[in-house]
Interface confidence: low
């Protein structure tokens, strides 16, 4: 009878992560008596995958009933494959012996490669907000994919970006890979509603790319513009001065009125008007009792937005000679009116 041969018909097998891999092995003879084992790798560091004789291998099932005397098929199926399972698998026949079984003959090996999907891309933006015309960086990361070939694109509101740098790690062979990309985006005033999208294409995705998004609203700060005006009043001894705070983002805003440099009132913006571009408008007014003033008054609207340095706009309120004459003995403070919103400027 010819000496036993161990036949592994497939040189390579490719499997998607999560699926089962069938590794085929057949013997040409039942002699000599002894178990077969499957190993990953060769040499002293090889890893035991399946032992016909003993042990417990939860992920491994045999394709045929190995206890049957006439069985020559020693193929196995490994369930729930992960990239960590990639490698060359050897089917090895042992001859029964003591104190240990003795290796008799090995198959040529089957290389298992694993196709693993990339993880959902995670896009993160800058730690601090930036103002329009400035450039901010967004990063996109995805992990655990195999093989290494992968395509990454960046979009802003559907328009492909070109200013980005991408790395795939590690550079050499690995069971799985990671991708890291940084895109530079120039902010514009209209970017509150904008999105950046990181799109990843990989062989495992069957033409349906993965996308990660980030909202520019998290990265942008649009500083307000201020306009202080006097509104007409019926009452001769009262002046209504308004401060229009326009086109700011995000919401957080505190306004302080000063009369001749002295704080008159501080308020936090509450009822805001949202513009179509996502920025906000707000208006505050100050009712000044002109009788209380002998001289002209400088009214200042001072705004602190999103924790930034305050910006201000002043308005000189002229007190007429007639009011100065009649107001010399009046000492009560200026009356303050509640705020009222102003219509949005889309």
């Amino acid at each position: 009878e010819d000496e036993l041969q161990v036949i592994q018909p497939e040189k390579s097998v490719s499997v998607a992560a999560g699926e089962s891999a069938t590794l085929r092995c057949a013997m040409t003879s039942l002699i000599p008596v002894g178990p077969i084992m499957w190993f990953r790798g060769a040499g002293a560091g090889r890893e035991l995958i399946y032992n016909q004789k003993e042990g417990h291998f939860p992920r491994v099932t045999t394709v045929s009933e190995l206890t049957k005397r006439n069985n020559l098929d020693f193929s196995i199926s490994i369930s729930n494959i992960t990239p960590a399972d990639a490698g060359t698998y050897y089917c090895v026949k042992f001859r029964k012996g003591s104190p240990d079984d003795v290796e008799f003959k090995s198959g040529a090996g089957t290389e298992l490669s694993v196709r693993a999907k990339p993880s959902a891309p995670v896009v993160s933006g800058p730690a601090v907000r930036a103002t329009p015309e400035h450039t901010v960086s967004f990063t996109c990361e995805s992990h655990g994919f195999s093989p290494r070939d992968i395509t990454l694109k960046w979009f802003k509101n559907g328009n492909e970006l070109s200013d980005f740098q991408t790395n795939v790690d590690p550079a050499g062979d690995s069971v799985s890979y990671s991708i890291h990309s940084t895109a530079r985006v120039v902010l514009t005033r209209g970017d509150v509603h904008s999105q950046v999208i990181c799109e990843i294409a990989h062989i495992t995705l069957q033409g349906d790319p993965l996308r990660g998004t980030a909202n520019l609203s998290e990265a942008i700060r649009v500083p307000p513009t201020l306009e202080v005006t006097q509104q007409p009043m019926r009452a001769e001894n009262q002046a209504n001065v308004t401060c229009q705070v326009s086109n700011f983002y995000p919401r957080g805003l505190q306004l302080t009125w000063l009369e001749n440099g002295n704080v008159s009132r501080t308020e936090t913006a509450s009822t805001l008007i949202e513009n179509k571009d996502g920025t906000y408008n707000w208006m505050s007014w100050l009712l000044v009792n002109t009788c209380a003033h002998r001289d002209d008054v400088v009214l200042t609207c001072q705004v602190e937005h999103d924790g930034q340095q305050a910006v201000s706009k002043s308005y000189a309120l002229e007190i007429s000679a007639h009011q100065k004459e009649h107001g010399s003995d009046i000492t009560h403070e200026a009356a303050l009116a509640p705020t009222a919103p102003l219509g949005g400027s889309g």
Partner: antibody, heavy 118, light 107 residues
Framework: EVQLVESGGGLVQPGGSLRLSCAAS????????MHWVRQATGKGLEWVSA???????YYTGSVKGRFTISRENAKNSLYLQMNSLRAADTAVYYC????????????WGQGTMVTVSS | DIQMTQSPSSLSASVGDRVTITCRAS??????LAWFQQKPGKAPKSLIY???SLHSGVPSKFSGSGSGTDFTLTISSLQPEDFATYYC?????????FGQGTKLEIK
């Protein structure tokens, strides 16, 4: 949520039979080695039986030939057919999932009580 | 069959104490040893597998060590919810066998 729920326990006379069921949810039972473990009142844990992913079955010596473990993949359920019951089989029976990597027990059912008494 | 012997059979300790339970196998079981916690009237809870790996959700105050025949379970700082019975188990070969249990009581 991964869960195992046993049922079928009860009072049975010595020599009688009982079939325990274990309904699995949150995972595919056939992908895991599954076990039955029992515990007599006030006593320790005792492994009873197992079924592998390939359908291979194992039993502790005291139940061999009397108990049969099986599973029904379509119902995602595990069973323990207990025949020729003895008073010594009185215990809470737990259905247990073996871990996917090394068969370490990871998920336990709440248990079902089997009382063998005349 | 592989025999598993736990010691001590019972143990009194106080909240905040560090306690160690030992488990010995009658033959080499590599590192295929698990630890379980059981409270009265409840199903056991899996704590540790392959001698030292914590199951998901198990607090890091639990730790295991050992290989071959001698193993230990350590609880670094006892809390009221830790007073229970602890079992070791070998799962290297059938029939799987458990230790007789260690009852951890409040001193």
């Amino acid at each position: 949520e991964v869960q195992l729920v046993e049922s079928g326990g009860g009072l049975v006379q010595p020599g009688g039979s009982l079939r325990l069921s274990c309904a699995a949810s949150g995972f595919t039972l056939s992908s895991y080695d599954m076990h039955w473990v029992r515990q007599a009142t006030g006593k320790g844990l005792e492994w009873v039986s197992a079924i592998g992913t390939a359908g291979d079955t194992y039993y502790t010596g005291s139940v061999k030939g009397r108990f049969t473990i099986s599973r029904e993949n379509a119902k995602n359920s595990l069973y323990l057919q207990m025949n020729s019951l003895r008073a010594a089989d009185t215990a809470v029976y737990y259905c247990v999932r073996g871990g996917v990597w090394d068969d370490a027990f990871d998920i336990w059912g709440q248990g079902t009580m089997v009382t063998v008494s005349s | 069959d592989i025999q598993m012997t736990q010691s001590p059979s019972s143990l009194s300790a106080s909240v905040g104490d560090r306690v160690t339970i030992t488990c010995r196998a009658s033959q080499d079981i590599n590192n295929y040893l698990a630890w379980f916690q059981q409270k009265p009237g409840k199903a056991p809870k899996s704590l540790i597998y392959t001698a030292s790996s914590l199951h998901s959700g198990v607090p890091s105050k639990f730790s295991g060590s050992g290989s071959g025949t001698d193993f230990t379970l350590t609880i670094s700082s006892l809390q009221p919810e830790d007073f229970a019975t602890y079992y070791c188990q070998q799962y290297v070969s059938y029939p799987y066998t458990f230790g007789q249990g260690t009852k951890l009581e409040i001193k």
